[in-house]
């Protein structure tokens, strides 16, 4: 069972230094700052699920050296930045979508001995990402169609 933590009750101030090992910003309608790093040097698990995020500003994650789990479920991601994908020890939780192709490719090319990457469908069922991309994102299919998996229920 994955660890969990409750979300901060106040509005998020990105200048705050967060000391916790777990941060829950799920379902807050957040927009991540483009040129500012999250200050959370202890965080192991960061939950950004259900925030309508399309982009993941690479600077935002730059100083999270201890991060192990990044929960991005229920966000309509258009792409995953290569620098983030290249963090081989980062466990990314995301919805099945063709936007994860870059993540898969970077991991395949840069990370050896990895367990199979997974993605989640709208019923919270796990899929092998490689198999999903092969079936749903083959050349000729519209990008990010993902066989309906890009529709998210919060």
């Amino acid at each position: 069972q994955e660890p969990s933590c409750t979300m901060p009750s106040t509005d998020v101030d990105w200048n705050t230094e967060f000391s916790a090992t777990c941060l829950n910003f799920s379902g807050r309608g957040l927009s991540l700052p483009l040129n500012q790093s999250l200050r959370a040097s202890n965080v192991l698990l960061l939950d950004l699920s259900g925030n309508g995020l399309r982009e993941l500003p690479v600077t935002f994650f730059a100083h999270l050296q201890k991060l192990e789990v990044l929960n991005l479920l229920h966000n309509p991601l258009s792409r995953v930045d290569g620098a983030l994908a290249a963090r081989c020890d980062l466990d990314l939780r995301a919805d099945c979508s063709c936007a994860l192709e870059s993540w898969h490719e970077v991991r395949r090319d840069n990370c050896s001995g990895q367990k199979p990457l997974l993605c989640w469908d709208t019923t919270s069922f796990q899929h092998n990402l490689s198999a999903f991309l092969e079936v749903s994102c083959a050349p000729g299919l519209a990008p990010a169609t993902g066989s309906g998996h890009h529709h998210h229920h919060h």
Epitope: Q1, E2, P3, S4, C5, T6, S19, A20, T21, C22, N24, S41, N42, L44, L45, Q65, K66, E68, V69, D89, D91, K115
Partner: antibody
Amino acid sequence: QVTLKESGPGTVQPSQTLSLTCSFSGFSLSTSGMGVSWIRQSSGKGLEWLAHIYWDDDKRYNPSLKSRLTISKDTSSNQVFLRITSVDTADTATYYCARRPRDFYGGGHWYFDVWGAGTTVTVSS
Amino acid sequence: DVVMTQTPKSMSMSVGERVTLNCKASENVGTYVSWYQQKPEQSPKLLIYGASNRYTGVPDRFTGSGSATDFTLTISSMQAEDLADYHCGQSYNFPLTFGAGTKLELK
């Protein structure tokens, strides 16, 4: 098999510096997510966390003792060290080192899965 | 610092009885709580992590539950080898902190 073993001087005089060594085997402290903490226990008392060192040499200290503590590691020889300066009788305790593992099949947890047997330190003149 | 308060300080139980140990955090720590068993003259051993995950090799009579501020370790049917001190600890925030322990004795 993962093992940790603490060693220390046994007795140290007040105001002196206490140096402790944790020798471990069965894992590498260069593995991402891995870390080792020092924790102590005074006679009949609870556990007190002192310091932690990460695989990337980042360190964390208990603020109540921070000015007196230094944690370090030698990855190649599989050892972690703790120095406590200006000791007094309140530092008399059993000192443990313990491993914080990285669980690649459900990350984000923090716990100590393996502890050393402990080394007893008495501060006395 | 997060204060972890364990109750009771000690308890005497008979073999086969159900044992419930409590741990209360002074602030919300999510599920970042572990339970450790410490037998006399031994070092602590991990029983439960993440509030409810049983560590490898731990008998299934040990169960952890709770979240936020209230946590429980239950031994469904106490065995003689369970006589020990039990410590809860939180790892949600630094400094990491532990409770004072509960001593489980034989009635």
